[in-house]
């Protein structure tokens, strides 16, 4: 005989679930023991069966899960899974916060990415700071020339996707350019999108030829010459 224990504690590490109103929430407490334990759920310390909840709840005992669809502010609270058998019991608390903030198209920090000047062979980092309620997807684009033109017949620029990423809200997204050459010079765009819309900002990378060692050595004096 064995008291209940968590079989996948790593899946339970996210204690606070802050989700937009209307989304689906799933809490899981996968467990085992001998005899096979039972699971029941509490909300704010009281037995929870979802009878007062519009849309009810889904309890999937074989998955040790509680599912609530279309969450609303009244669903906020502490949800406890209580797993027990004849030998013992264990419990775990999840905190649910339902966000009512108006989701907006991504907001990009002013001045990022910033115009940058680099020397051939050096490394460059372009930064993009994105604020978004809904999880944003980010693309780094380079504006390119096709058949001698930067723009298509529709008047929109030709672009090449360099990198795509899904990031968490308020993270800094970085485009790394290693060992830059003259061909890397040009316009770069950070494009952020979410379910509401797109936002983008651009910057120019200027690539200078490798510095002449003689010129470099003389440079400090040159600064003070009229």
């Amino acid at each position: 005989q064995q008291a209940p224990y968590w079989t996948h504690p790593q899946r339970m590490e996210k204690k606070l679930h802050a989700v937009p109103a209307g989304n689906t929430v799933k809490f899981r407490c996968p467990a085992a023991g001998n005899p096979t334990p039972t699971i029941r759920w509490l909300k704010d310390g009281q037995a929870f069966h979802g009878e007062n909840r519009i849309g009810g709840i889904r309890l999937r005992h074989q998955h040790w899960s509680l599912v609530m669809e279309s969450v609303v502010p009244s669903d906020r609270g502490t949800y406890t899974c209580l797993v027990e058998n004849a030998v013992g019991s264990i419990r775990y608390n999840y905190l649910l916060d339902v966000l009512e903030r108006s989701p907006h198209r991504p907001i990009l920090q002013a001045g990022l990415p910033a115009n940058t000047t680099a020397v051939v062979g050096s490394d460059v980092e372009l930064l993009c700071k994105v604020y978004s309620d809904a999880q944003p997807h980010i693309q780094w684009l380079k504006h390119i020339v096709i058949n001698g033109s930067s723009f298509g017949a529709d008047g929109f620029p030709y672009v090449q996707v360099l990198k795509t990423a899904d990031i968490n809200s308020s993270e800094v997204e970085v485009l790394y350019l290693r060992n830059v050459s003259a061909e890397d010079a040009g316009e770069y765009t950070c494009l952020a999108g979410n379910s509401i819309g797109l936002s983008y900002q651009s910057a120019w990378l200027t690539v200078l030829p490798e510095e002449d060692p003689t010129w470099t050595a003389a440079a400090p004096e040159a600064r003070y010459t009229d």
Epitope: R105, I107, S195
Partner: antibody, heavy 124, light 112 residues
Framework: EVQLLESGGGVVQPGRSLRLSCAAS????????MHWVRQAPGKGLEWVAV????????YYADSVKGRFTISRDNSKNTLSLQMNSLRVEDTAIYYC?????????????????WGQGTMVTVSS | DIVMTQTPLSLSVTPGQPASISCRSS???????????VYWYVQKSGQPPQLLIY???NRFSGVPDRFSGSGSRTDFTLKISRVEAEDVGVYYC?????????FGGGTKVEIK
């Protein structure tokens, strides 16, 4: 040709449920957020809900929160709106609308393509 | 929520004459990326809305150049330089900055 075609409308009693569908064609459906917008007879336009391109984010108007559920099946190019606990004031034409896509916008980033709409009447 | 207030409620115009519709938002629609996310639609009888203008002043493909959009931050205008019979319908402005997306109440344009 880019097209959205709604179906599933009809007459239903208050408190009942209805499921609307929207079939998309002519574009890469899985790359676009999708919206539902409704229009009560003789009235203006009211936004109802949006779902992100992969279904991970959903947002609703306060008037339908907790009663309506937006979902999508990218393998079938289909958008759905499950409407529960229907009220008389939900009576409207429901339009499926294409939202923002991935990639550099060559034109508006969504709300450019609308379906023809499907009529939902909630009446006792 | 952002409230969109449209004026006038209706407009009766002689063919060939100009027409102007105003829309005011309760908050600025100028976004951090420098664009102003106001859209204009026309809805003709028995049809879904059709996009005319996006991002304040960009004409959607296929829209005649007699339609133009202008404004800044919270005050927006749709102008028809010379109204034609086919322009009859209800015109709506919409904000596309945040959810819930909101529409103006509509302006009905008729021909005299």
């Amino acid at each position: 040709e880019v097209q959205l075609l709604e179906s599933g409308g009809g007459v239903v009693q208050p408190g009942r449920s209805l499921r609307l569908s929207c079939a998309a064609s002519g574009f890469t459906f899985s790359s676009y957020a999708m919206h539902w917008v409704r229009q009560a007879p003789g009235k203006g336009l009211e936004w109802v809900a949006v779902i992100s391109y992969d279904g991970s984010n959903k947002y609703y108007a306060d008037s339908v929160k907790g009663r309506f559920t937006i979902s999508r099946d990218n393998s079938k190019n289909t958008l759905s709106l499950q409407m529960n606990s229907l009220r008389v004031e939900d009576t409207a034409i429901y339009y499926c609308v294409r939202g923002a896509g991935h990639g550099f916008p060559t034109g508006p980033d969504g709300f450019d393509i609308w379906g023809q709409g499907t009529m939902v009447t909630v009446s006792s | 929520d952002i409230v969109m207030t449209q004026t006038p409620l209706s407009l009766s115009v002689t063919p060939g004459q100009p027409a102007s519709i105003s829309c005011r938002s309760s908050r600025s629609l100028l976004h951090s990326d420098g664009k102003t996310y106001v859209y204009w639609y026309v809805q003709k009888s028995g049809q879904p809305p059709q996009l005319l203008i996006y991002e304040l002043s960009n004409r959607f493909s296929g829209v005649p150049d007699r339609f133009s959009g202008s404004g800044s931050r919270t005050d927006f205008t749709l102008k028809i330089s010379r109204v034609e019979a086919e322009d009859v319908g209800v015109y709506y402005c919409m904000q596309y900055v945040e959810a819930p997306l909101t529409f103006g109440g509509g302006t009905k344009v008729e021909i005299k």
